[in-house]
């Protein structure tokens, strides 16, 4: 469960892939589309508001009792819209919603290296936001394999 209704911190950052492609958001027919693309040098990168929440890891899974805390993030590129996991479609979508946000809007933050992060679905452990065919998608990662798969690695630039 998320231990507080308020984020412990927030930051405004642009999101790019491991290969330095930008994640951009465009309003089309009254809904937002998410793109993964090479930006022209003079084009400004879209910013995302990341809100960080503390979450207790279920002790039955971890054996940690009260000591297993995770950082969950929500990602909002524009007011009232949040990235959400659609586990049925294996897709990542932007939805307008009110608080409290649904579980599908929360992602467990992983620092894969000092500069790279991954976002794991709160609602589907082992499934991460990733890049597939120049779009964001949900990608299942086998923990026995190398978790450094480049298609689930992202960089945050404030």
């Amino acid at each position: 469960s998320i231990t507080g209704i308020s984020p412990i911190t927030e930051s405004l950052a642009s999101l790019s892939t491991y290969n330095d492609q930008s994640i951009t958001f465009a309003l089309e027919d009254e809904s937002y589309e998410i793109y993964v693309e090479d930006l022209k040098k003079d084009k400004k990168k879209d910013k995302v508001l990341l809100s960080y929440y503390e979450s207790q890891h279920p002790s039955s899974e971890s054996g940690d009792g009260v000591d297993g805390k995770m950082l969950m993030v929500t990602l909002s590129p524009t007011k009232d819209f949040w990235l959400q996991a659609n586990n049925k479609e294996h897709s990542v979508e932007l939805h307008k919603c009110e608080k409290p946000l649904p579980d599908q809007a929360f992602f467990v933050l992983h620092n894969r290296s000092f500069n790279c992060v991954s976002f794991e679905c709160k609602t589907d452990p082992g499934v991460f936001i990733g890049v597939k065919d120049n779009h964001l998608a949900l990608i299942k990662v086998d923990y026995s394999e190398n978790l450094g798969s480049e298609n689930i690695l992202f960089k945050l630039s404030e």
Partner: antibody, heavy 121, light 106 residues
């Protein structure tokens, strides 16, 4: 209860080597970033090394780069610090520390009690 | 590398005093900053994380503020058990500690 217990400290001559160990218990060791921090006698704290949960990446300040190596054995819930080419200025209490959260590099939430390394001829 | 400069390096205060310690980063670190308390012969203890959040079990007389390059740790009413050394610590770019502030009894 989270526990971190360092061992392996002692007296070593300049130019010598030492390997410190940290035995971890009470948490899922393989899910956390781990760190070594040192404190010279009467001085402040200095970060010495960091390692990712899967040991894929490690990091060092310039003061120890090329001489110290951090490693971990997730099957044994153990963290290590291999220290080579030791100098008098490496004399310090060495602490093992755990990240505050699963998977992330932020904050040193738990610390061991430290092990003293003395480099002297 | 980011340098963290703490001031003062030491201060004398009495029980009940309001104490303020400052930390300045050599470049902006947003709020990726902690405060630690260390007593002689003991390991450091996390007090404040992400600039302002109180670690579980830490008394509410401790508070943190600041963002960017300038940060403050405040003890609203100093208690006997608060005489210790305090360190700031950044994790925005690499990891580095401030030089420490020793809080002594006046």
């Amino acid at each position: 209860e989270v526990q971190l217990v360092e061992s392996g400290g002692g007296l070593v001559q300049p130019g010598g080597s030492l390997r410190l160990s940290c035995a971890a218990s009470g948490f899922t060791f393989s899910s956390y970033w781990m760190y070594w921090v040192r404190q010279a006698p009467g001085k402040g704290l200095e970060w010495v090394a960091a390692i990712t949960p899967n040991a894929g990446e490690d990091y060092y300040p310039e003061s120890v780069k090329g001489r110290f190596t951090i490693s971990r054995d997730n099957a044994k819930n153990s963290l290590y610090l291999q220290m080579n080419s030791l100098r008098a200025e490496d004399t310090a209490v060495y602490y093992c520390a755990r990240g505050q959260y699963y998977y992330t590099k932020y904050s040193l939430g738990y610390w061991g009690q430290g092990t003293l390394v003395t480099v002297s001829s | 590398d980011i340098q963290m400069t703490q001031s003062p390096s030491s201060l004398s205060a009495s029980v009940g005093d309001r104490v303020t310690i400052t930390c300045r980063a050599s470049q902006p670190i947003h709020n990726h900053l902690d405060w630690y308390q260390q007593k002689p012969g003991k390991a450091p203890k996390l007090l404040i994380y992400f600039g302002k959040n109180l670690q579980e079990g830490v008394p509410s007389r401790f508070s943190g503020s600041g963002s960017g390059t300038d940060f403050t740790l405040t003890i609203s009413s100093l208690q006997p058990e608060d005489f210790a050394t305090y360190y700031c610590f950044q994790y925005k770019k690499g990891w580095s500690f401030g030089g420490g502030t020793k809080v002594e009894i006046k």
